[in-house]
């Protein structure tokens, strides 16, 4: 769609005559008829296929034609077309004399024609005017013409419709060829896609206007390149949305379970070594001289009452020292210089000689203890209840009230680990945070008290004559209990038969 524009500039008819040569009376009142048609090698009469237009009377005889376009007048003349401009044309311009006011063809005598010019040629669409002048014997016409596209039509032949736009179906202006020129910040075939903030993640971000970066669900950050971890994730990260990958030392669905309590809380005191043993649990290995769950207690080596037979304990820098009562000696006052003849057993304790009278042992009545039955049993003073159990005196007996998670007479068994009695040879089982520990009786060792360590003096069957052999664990010696009729440290002599000596 476009417009052929014809600008009439000057018409000269000095003699004021018609084409026939006859003069106009009083002068030639001149108007023009214009016919625009398809290209013809020889311009001939016929339909004005591209359009036709007429002017009012513009002047008499010779005159200049005023440019009236600014005032909305008829110069230049407009011949609109609603097709693709072919690039070629034929143009006929006729000058007519109007004797009266009626300018219709049928109202004019045929000899009212002043002049007729016909041209044809090529004409490209453009803003520039082509100036032309046509002269006949009696007249001269100066004019210019051009073809321009109608509003919103573009291209070499005005065939491309383009309407500038700034809504969600496009943000563009039109180039001279009719192609779209996107407004800043927009892209796409129809400039309907905003250019997001530079660096905005292609998949995880989007925008509805330029320089914006809106995040899709599960993503965050200025460029939507940071995933959002699982809601409640404490000490973790993600590589895809809603993940919770735990930082080192943390565990659980939300990474809120402390697997490295040692590093995060440093619970062990006094230079102890800390070992993680599960979620929020740890074990402290104390340096010598310290005790307690966190090795927070300074150890007095006398606390374990190492002195026997009433010996008193004295702390020293490098350990302890037992002061023994009369009749006892040894590191722990464990050796006696007394025998049953000295009646060493108090409180009705009965004395048993051992090692052929070189030693003795007291058998204490109920409620008394000590190697000489000298101590009245306060069943709770020895703190028999393990693992924080509470000791309750019940007359001649006592009982332990255990903390949750522990059982056994002395609360010595952890419900879970010690329930299956893992300690052999009467070993005492202690449940620890990270497993269990067996306290072995004398003569046994190993993680489960499975290794016999003392030499069983009876193992070589030293007693004769079906005597019963007893091992003294404190001295690794044996005692033979002779049947009737036999005597001797090994029951090797029948009664009445003195030993035969070699001399």
């Amino acid at each position: 769609s476009g417009v052929f524009q014809l600008q009439l500039q000057e018409f000269i008819n000095e003699r004021g005559v018609l084409a026939s040569g006859r003069p106009c009376e009083p002068g030639c009142r001149t108007f023009f008829r214009v016919c625009l048609k398809h290209f013809q090698a020889v311009v001939s009469p016929g339909p004005c296929t591209f359009g036709t237009v007429s002017t009012p009377v513009l002047g008499t005889n010779s005159f200049a034609v005023r440019d009236d376009s600014s005032g909305g007048g008829r110069n230049p003349l407009q011949l609109p077309f609603n097709f693709t401009w072919p690039g070629t044309f034929s143009l006929i311009i006729e000058a007519w004399h109007a004797p009266g006011d009626d300018l219709r063809p049928e109202a004019l005598p045929p000899d009212a024609l002043i002049s007729k010019i016909a041209i044809q040629g090529s004409l490209a669409v453009g803003q520039n005017w082509l100036l032309d002048e046509q002269t006949s014997t009696l007249t001269r016409l100066r004019y210019s013409y051009r073809v321009i596209c109608s509003d919103n039509y573009y291209g070499d032949n005005c065939s491309r419709l383009c309407k500038k736009r700034n809504d969600h179906f496009g943000h563009y202006v039109c180039q001279p060829d009719g192609n779209l020129s996107c407004l800043p910040g927009w892209t796409g075939e129809y400039c309907q896609q905003p250019i997001c903030l530079s660096g905005c993640h292609e998949q995880n971000g989007y925008c509805s206007k330029p320089a914006e970066c809106l995040c899709r669900p599960g993503w965050q950050g200025r460029l939507c390149n940071e995933c959002i971890p699982h809601n409640g994730c404490r000490h973790g990260t993600c590589s895809t949305p809603w993940q919770c990958t735990c930082d080192e030392g943390w565990g659980g669905l939300f990474c809120d379970q402390d697997l490295n309590y040692c590093t995060h809380h440093s619970p062990c005191k006094n230079g102890a070594t800390c070992s993680n043993s599960g979620q929020r649990s740890y074990t402290c290995t104390c340096r010598p001289g310290y005790t307690g769950v966190d090795c927070e207690l300074e150890l007095s080596e006398c606390d374990s009452n190492p002195c026997r037979n009433g010996g008193s304990c004295k702390d020293q820098e490098d350990g302890y020292h037992c002061l023994c009562p009369p009749g006892y000696y040894g590191l722990h006052c464990e050796h006696s210089t007394l025998s049953c003849a000295d009646s060493p057993c108090f409180n009705g304790g009965s004395c048993r000689e051992r090692n052929q009278g070189a030693n003795y042992a007291c058998e204490c009545p109920p409620n008394f203890t000590g190697s000489n039955c000298e101590k009245k049993v306060d069943r709770c003073t020895s703190n028999p209840c393990a693992n924080g159990g509470q000791c309750l005196n019940r007359g001649p007996s006592r009982m332990c009230r255990c903390r949750p998670g522990f059982t056994g007479t002395y609360c010595e068994l952890h419900v879970s680990d010690c329930a299956r009695n893992p300690c052999a040879h009467g070993g005492t089982c202690h449940d620890l945070e990270n497993g269990l520990m067996c306290t072995c009786p004398a003569g046994f060792s190993g993680r489960r008290c499975e290794v016999r360590t003392s030499i069983d003096a009876c193992a070589s069957s030293p007693c004769f004559n079906r005597a019963t052999c007893y091992t003294d664990l404190s001295t690794d010696t044996f005692v033979c209990n002779c049947p009737y009729g036999f005597v001797g440290s090994r029951c090797e002599f029948p009664v009445g038969l003195p030993p035969s000596f070699p001399w």
């Epitope: 509003d151 809504d167 179906f169 075939e189």
Partner: antibody, heavy 121, light 107 residues
Framework: EVQLVESGGGLVQPGGSLRLSCAVS??????????WGWIRQAPGKGLEWIGD???????YYNPSLKSRVTISVDTSKNSFYLQMNSLRAEDTAVYYC?????????????WGQGTLVTVSS | EYVLTQSPDFQSVTPKEKVTITCSGQ??????ASWYQQKPDQSPKLVIY???KRPSGVPSRFSGSNSGDDATLTINSLEAEDAATYYC?????????FGQGTKVEIK
Amino acid sequence: EVQLVESGGGLVQPGGSLRLSCAVSGGSISSSSYYWGWIRQAPGKGLEWIGDIYYTGSTYYNPSLKSRVTISVDTSKNSFYLQMNSLRAEDTAVYYCAREDVILRGGSDYWGQGTLVTVSS
Amino acid sequence: EYVLTQSPDFQSVTPKEKVTITCSGQRLGDKYASWYQQKPDQSPKLVIYEDSKRPSGVPSRFSGSNSGDDATLTINSLEAEDAATYYCQAWDRDTGVFGQGTKVEIK
């Protein structure tokens, strides 16, 4: 062949709300060439544009309805939705969903069959 | 608020006659006009887009133009199946606007 199917119409009390769905088949709702719109038509009256949405979630609304309308999209279900609140009798209409084509300069080349919403007590 | 006004509201035409419906709006020629045909109890159907283009399947008797303040839908030789209500539509900024409709009836 692209098809749009509306659902969710029916009788609604004045002051209530409606949620209509438009399921798209035969083409992806995530194409950059289309907006997805809602248009309504009161009984015996003309067409009124309600609003539209792009697959990214960008929305545009008729200023006269904007305060009561929300359009959303679920690309995984290839569907988009119209939520309208504070309904009154004059909201009684057949509600259509349509595809608005950027290449057709915003012309709607595919329409749903429409779903009737009646606002009455 | 942008308004599109169609004229006439109603037209009764004999078959083979030419039908012209005008849609007027301020500087409508600077916008793209679309035309929809709606038959009773049916969804609207696009018959003209981008002022004058026809979607495939729309008969060539339908044509459109748009310049100045007016867009025009022309049905060159009306057929019985063309009885319907016709709506013009354009976009003003980001809002879709429809004309009030023109009902075309067969005499």
